[in-house]
Amino acid sequence: THLGIRLPLRSGLAGPPLGLRLPRETDEESEEPGRRGSFVEMVDNLRGKSGQGYYVEMTVGSPPQTLNILVDTGSSNFAVGAAPHPFLHRYYQRQLSSTYRDLRKGVYVPYTQGKWEGELGTDLVSIPHGPNVTVRANIAAITESDKFFINGSNWEGILGLAYAEIARPDDSLEPFFDSLVKQTHIPNIFSLQLCGAGFPLNQTEALASVGGSMIIGGIDHSLYTGRLWYTPIRREWYYEVIIVRVEINGQDLKMDCKEYNYDKSIVDSGTTNLRLPKKVFEAAVKSIKAASSTEKFPDGFWLGEQLVCWQAGTTPWNIFPVISLYLMGEVTNQSFRITILPQQYLRPVEDVATSQDDCYKFAVSQSSTGTVMGAVIMEGFYVVFDRARKRIGFAVSACHVHDEFRTAAVEGPFVTADMEDCGYNIPQTDESTLMTGRA
């Protein structure tokens, strides 16, 4: 659904001290498009609260109106609250902007649960902690919504960073990032470092914490360790990729790899969980249960509903397995794997038991629309959306939560044959892009 599972996330604190960072394995600067090295002004420009989304500050209109905007790589509309709503502290007031232009067209976006609708226009947009540019972009002014805005989330709109093919009402509405690249000299690349908290945050900490970084126009080397590994973007609509193998604690799930990508696999910062197709989810949970069988957890925990609590500081991370996804590599018959820890897929939940407890939700869930690599995956990695070269890069995030025994990993190469067969070909119908629920 749009709420909870669909709209994410966890706020986070800055990463470990530099002393805990691993040395760089290779220097890949020659391979990287765009500006290289340091993007100091963009580091730590994201904030977030557990399960409620990572947002960036943006300004719209003239004079500029400041809004917090959810960063969503799983959609393609720039849409902002433009009318009073009980959950909004502020909203876009078009009548106060001298540069607003009405496109005289409506837009309606239904989700499996909830919806938003609004009026299309254009206005001047900038990102204060981003590149020093102002662009004219399409804006959907949300006038009505249901179960879209989240009480206390602190964001007032959504920045869809995916491709025009899934824009609403149709692919003629140019997404924000396309406008940005067209109107400036900014390279066609952005990267995200989402920093999960790893422990429940109280209200004060959550509001004060840094959530991560959105680097527009390049790659910041301070945000990752080791090397970047790239997987092709299969098709430019969602950020679609191909998973070729799944392992739980090194044990292959041994499924036909088409199942892993049925009906697609996407990288989506606007989803909290790692979401897996039904058959894959069932096999993965069975394997995770077996690996953690020294303890038993309630049925509702594995459904992502019940919370499990341990005395503060005693969470038995060691009994939970690591999850590895093998992604198609850039070279024929070559793949690489990304490995996440329970520190990523057990999501801390605040304010439910006592302050003496650490409580978690299981953040792997079932999907009817394919694999969704949401925050649970992204919080382990620095993720590079290299649109110019139609590829997505993964490296171990400098801020990922881990312990003294295990760390998230990006490793390769591995020899994997017939990876093209792992992709699922969706039957083309006029209705195919109407499934925005991501339930």
Epitope: K296, E305, Q306, L307, C309, D351
Partner: antibody, heavy 120, light 108 residues
């Protein structure tokens, strides 16, 4: 059918350790479908969860009692036990053992309970 | 910490009447809530689990409803053996640990 029976001294002196055992009959304590728990009820008052244990020995305790509680399991005897140290009069209660079933979320089967009085 | 508040503390009714007992959680517990019946000198007995499912052997006159923060136990027509204390318990936060303070259903 499965039954639970608490046993142990009915009188414990202040500052000593309360020890109770729950014997499971008519079924195996080693079932992977259940946890086993202790709950107490002071006279005329409500129910208070003390802690739970899995047959593997994995334990969970009420944070307010954790420093004084130990729950253990003996699968060979089909029993689990409670030890509560440094008792005071406030620990006087009926102590129940129970099975945690229905998705290991609810206390679906209870022993009859045993009254433990803390007094010198 | 999730606190369960039961109301009323005491309910005075006659046999054959309908009893409605309330349990309110300080924050959402989804549908992970149970009801227990305890008669004097006896152990509690599970009546309802997951807010609305009757446990094995529980008569149909007992029903549970609600989700989120507000839950109700209804006894459609009180039998003499139904006069007892009723407790709710949440299992949203696991391990199950929190009981309500109880509602006493007494004969009017």
């Amino acid at each position: 059918q499965l039954q639970l029976q608490e046993s142990g001294p009915g009188l414990v002196k202040p500052s000593e350790t309360l020890s109770l055992t729950c014997t499971v009959s008519g079924g195996s304590i080693s079932s992977s479908s259940y946890y086993w728990g202790w709950i107490r009820q002071p006279p005329g008052k409500g129910l208070e969860w003390i802690g739970s244990i899995y047959y593997s020995g994995s334990t969970y305790y009420n944070p307010s009692l954790k420093s004084r509680v130990t729950i253990s399991v003996d699968t060979s005897k089909n029993q689990f036990s409670l030890k509560l140290s440094s008792v005071t009069a406030a620990d006087t209660a009926v102590y129940y053992c129970a099975r945690v079933g229905h998705g290991i979320s609810y206390f679906d089967l209870w022993g009859r309970g045993t009254l433990v009085t803390v007094s010198s | 910490e999730i606190v369960l508040t039961q109301s009323p503390a005491t309910l005075s009714l006659s046999p054959g009447e309908r009893a409605t007992l309330s349990c309110r959680a300080s924050q959402s517990v989804s549908s992970y809530l149970a009801w227990y019946q305890q008669k004097p000198g006896q152990a509690p007995r599970l009546l309802i689990y997951d807010a609305s499912n009757r446990a094995t052997g529980i008569p149909a006159r007992f029903s549970g409803s609600g989700s989120g923060t507000d839950f109700t136990l209804t006894i459609s027509s009180l039998e003499p053996e139904d006069f007892a204390v009723y407790y709710c318990q949440q299992a949203y936060v696991w391990p199950p640990r929190t009981f309500g303070g109880g509602t006493k259903v007494e004969i009017k």
